[in-house]
């Protein structure tokens, strides 16, 4: 069927449109285009005879039309009047006529719109504002944007005049935004420049900062006032009703009790004509005395003495506060406060109780702190440590031993060799030692204040040759996948190489094996049952090479998931049921059985003679390793059939 397609359907003024013909019949004589929905000679635009290829303009021809051999019609430089229907009249060679009608619409190209406003400075909660999108254009749609978002739903927003007018009733400061309008028709869309709504508001009730109203004599008073307002507010200060100054800040240095009173800030908006005030009452206090701490014991002895710290002076109706190490008091049974909090007692002082301690007196306004007090706790001496830790030295070297014991006051030291006093120094030095210098070296630490003494004895062997080493371990029964084990090769000696073997082989490369302390310590991280091997350490120096006896690591593991044997699950009635449970575990696990959830016996083997179908059910074996604290279990279903009913069943002997 003959049809006309308009490309485009909506045409902008000044552009062109093509009336495209589809399904044009064969064997044509000619065709004519008419303005309108029917063939009307007065409204003929153009005719075309195929045989002569001659185009003849009609009465409605404007000079902007071009006809094509395929009967399509191009209309250029479109005007508004071109809107409407167009009819093609086709005359076939057999002189039979055929008609088709097409149409298009013409729209103007829209200009860039602008916004007009009936009120450039509306007042909050009082005025309305009407924005109008200019110009008024026929067949145009009007849209509005606020801060580049479509209009929010609000009872205070109203569109009218075909959406051309946007009215904001009872404007608020939150309506201060960027407004744009947009005009649209089928051929164009244009957006206006933004218009910023300047809402006049305030002043709100002013806020005075800082908030504190209590001051100490001698301080500076610095008050600041702020009220939300557009345009910004003008500020005035009044003290006890008397005008002071027209500034946002009020500053009074070195205040006295006489500066106590009511301070008023007034905020004024010249555009809205509104005033708001806020009043704060300022109280100036005279300076209280600075507190200080007294102690009943300036040199307490650790674990023996108690100390009472008292906050002075005593003032009626005063709150006393305490701090230790700049923190509030920790909860401790060794710390006691008196009823009025003025006395802090430390029961059985320790070296960690040195402080510093501070007390404070709280008045209406602030807290006055005392100077910090540090306790001189007398302690020690602790057991002395002798360094270095070597026990073997080679002949000819210098022996330099140092002794240290934690002590207050610092300890006085004495050295003894084989029980004979040598010198009263912290360090012992013997040059060019020989085997005759082997012996028991004792360091004695003495605290003259507490009168306590402690000693440490160290065996020193002077020998070019090292003894047979031994291995010490920090964990004799490590748990698999949990514990680490550190083996240490003894003794510790100078200029010594330490070596390690596992099962007679040199150490394997493993991220779980780590050598430290000059290879003297071998650490196995996250031990596994495969680490249960023989470990040997070796020591080598200039004249000796010796190996330790092997130490076998006893790794506790499991229990693994148990296995119930035999694997059969089907039995004949009358057979004996003999189930054995096994789980890899070190030490061997404890076994127990449950049938259908009911505890049975604590044995590795479960035996039931002459079973019947009543013995059907779930058989669970539970294993537990008390050493690892771990448990495991497995469940097996047993089916007992009446004799001879099911082939291939186990006799279950």
């Amino acid at each position: 069927k003959l049809t006309i397609e308009s490309t485009p359907f909506n045409v902008a003024e000044g552009k062109e449109v093509l009336l495209l013909v589809h399904n044009l019949p064969q064997h044509l004589f000619g065709y004519s285009w008419y303005k309108g929905e029917r063939v009307d000679g007065n409204r003929q635009i153009i005719g075309y005879v195929i045989g002569t290829q001659q185009a003849t303009p009609g009465p409605a021809y404007s000079g902007r039309e071009i006809i094509y051999p395929n009967a399509s019609l191009l209309i250029q430089n479109i005007i508004q009047n071109d809107t409407g229907f167009y009819t093609l009249h086709v005359i076939k060679s057999d002189l039979v006529n055929e008609e088709a009608t097409g149409q298009f619409r013409v729209y103007p190209e829209l200009p860039k719109p602008s916004i007009s406003s009936n009120n450039s400075k509306p007042v909050e909660d009082k005025d309305a504002v009407a924005f109008t999108c200019e110009p008024e254009t026929q067949d145009a749609t009007y849209l509005w944007w606020v801060n580049n978002q479509s209009l929010p739903v609000s009872p205070r927003l109203q569109l009218s005049n075909g959406n051309r007018t946007l009215t904001l009733f009872n404007v608020t400061r939150n309506d201060t935004a960027s407004y744009k309008c947009e005009t649209q028709n089928p051929v164009s869309a244009r957006r206006s420049d933004s218009v910023i709504l300047n809402v006049l508001y305030g002043p709100d009730a002013p806020t005075i900062s800082p908030l504190n109203t209590s001051y100490r004599s001698g301080e500076n008073l610095n008050l600041s006032c702020h009220a939300a307002s557009n345009p910004p507010a003008q500020y005035s200060w009044f003290v006890n009703g008397t005008f002071q100054q027209s500034t946002q800040e009020l500053f009074i240095p070195n205040i006295t009790v006489n500066n106590s009173g009511s301070y008023t800030c007034q905020a004024h908006n010249s555009d809205t004509g509104l005033n708001r005030t806020t009043v704060t009452t300022i109280t100036v206090y005279a300076e209280p005395p600075k507190p200080f701490i007294t102690s009943n014991n300036s040199n307490p002895v650790e674990d023996e003495d108690a100390v009472a710290l008292t906050c002075e002076p005593e003032i009626q109706n005063t709150t006393y506060l305490w701090w230790v190490n700049n923190q509030s008091l920790p909860v401790s049974p060794r710390l006691q406060l008196s009823n009025d909090n003025r006395t802090l007692t430390l029961l059985s002082v320790t070296r960690n109780d040195v402080g510093p301690y501070e007390c404070g007196i709280q008045n209406e306004l602030s807290v006055d702190h005392s100077d910090p007090v540090i306790l001189n706790v007398l302690y020690g001496p602790d057991d002395p440590t002798i360094s270095p830790s070597y026990t073997y030295y080679r002949p000819g070297v210098n022996l330099s031993l140092s002794c240290h014991a934690a002590s207050n006051p610092p300890a006085q030291y004495s050295w003894l060799i084989d029980g004979n006093i040598q010198q009263h120094t912290q360090e012992l030095f013997i040059s060019n030692i020989t085997e005759k210098n082997s012996g028991l070296y004792t360091c004695q630490a003495n605290n003259s204040a507490s009168g306590h003494s402690r000693t440490t004895v160290k065996t020193i062997t002077v020998s070019a040759e090292l003894p047979k080493p031994s291995i010490s371990s920090n964990n004799s029964k490590p748990v698999e996948d949990k514990d680490a084990v550190a083996f240490t090769c003894e003794p510790e000696a100078q200029n010594t190489t330490y070596l390690w073997w596992v099962n007679g082989q040199s150490l394997p490369v493993s991220p779980r094996l780590q050598l430290s302390n000059g290879n003297r310590t071998l650490t196995l991280f996250n031990v596994t049952r495969n680490d249960a091997r023989a470990y040997v350490c070796g020591i080598q120096n200039s004249v000796s090479a010796n190996r330790s006896d092997p130490v076998t690591l006893d790794v506790l593991y499991g229990p693994d998931t148990p296995i119930i044997s035999p694997p059969d699950s089907s039995y004949l009635s009358g057979a004996n049921l003999n189930l054995s449970c096994h789980s890899a575990s070190n030490p061997s696990p404890q076994y127990s059985w449950r049938i259908n959830g009911i505890p049975q016996q604590h044995t590795q083997v479960l035996f039931i003679a002459k079973i019947t179908p009543n013995n059907n059910g779930t058989y669970a074996c539970f294993v537990s390793n008390l050493a690892t604290g771990r448990n495991n279990s497995i469940v097996k279903s047993i089916t007992v059939s009446a004799s001879g009913t099911s082939p291939g069943l186990s006799a279950g002997a």
Epitope: P395, E435, S463, A464, W501, N541, A545
Partner: antibody, heavy 120, light 106 residues
């Protein structure tokens, strides 16, 4: 295979310096202490001293101090003995010697020995 | 210096005999070590740290002792055991050897 190969002159003039070198193979001298021992003809063994090639530390028998020097060249894996102002009493077979861990076992290795005769 | 006194300085024994050599130190030592030396050869470590047999040493050899007095024993003398045996202390410098015990077959 661990080996100690000695080299040096078999004849040294009195008052001159005896100089012997020991080249090690099969192990790194830097990891061990290297000793020198001598044995005068028909007599017993006499320890001269050791050197730690890693840092050059030495320990000499008092009898030889003042005229003995031990040196090591770790890049060549060799060490040497120098004994100055020799006399006929220094005529002996000189051995280089090391005590090392060969795998799991502590092993004792000796050079083949060099007979040094002090004579004019 | 620690003096090492070995005795006897030589001894003659028959194949299968039990042979004992003693070594006395002038001061206490940690361990005693024993070397075997055959004519024209370098010494070989035979027993280390008083009682440990060096690699390849037959079990008929043994060592014992402590402090200043140590013993070297062959439970059943064999022809291949003919050599000079030296004791050595390594406890203090200088390291010192005994004067040696020459072992011969009768």
């Amino acid at each position: 295979e661990v080996q100690l190969q000695q080299s040096g002159p078999g004849l040294v003039r009195p008052s001159q310096t005896l100089s012997l070198t020991c080249t090690a193979s099969g192990f790194n001298i830097k990891d061990n202490y290297m000793h020198w021992v001598r044995q005068p003809p028909g007599r017993g063994l006499e320890w001269i001293g050791w050197i730690d090639p890693e840092n050059g530390d030495t320990e000499y028998a008092p009898k030889f101090r003042g005229r003995v020097t031990m040196l090591a060249d770790t890049s060549k894996n060799q060490f040497s003995l120098r004994l100055s102002s020799v006399t006929a009493a220094d005529t002996a077979v000189y051995y280089c010697h090391v005590l090392i861990y060969a795998g799991y076992l502590a092993m004792d290795y000796w050079g083949q020995g060099t007979l040094v005769t002090v004579s004019s | 210096d620690i003096q090492m006194t070995q005795s006897p300085s030589s001894l003659s024994a028959s194949v299968g005999d039990r042979v004992t050599i003693t070594c006395s130190a002038s001061s206490s030592v940690t361990y005693m070590h024993w070397y075997q030396q055959k004519p024209g050869k370098a010494p070989k470590l035979w027993i280390y740290s008083t009682s440990n047999l060096a690699s390849g040493v037959p079990s008929r050899f043994s060592g014992s002792g402590s402090g200043t007095d140590y013993t070297f024993t062959i439970s059943s003398l064999q022809p291949e055991d003919i050599a000079t045996y030296y004791c050595q202390q390594r406890s203090t410098y200088p390291l010192t050897f005994g004067q040696g015990t020459k072992l011969e077959i009768k």
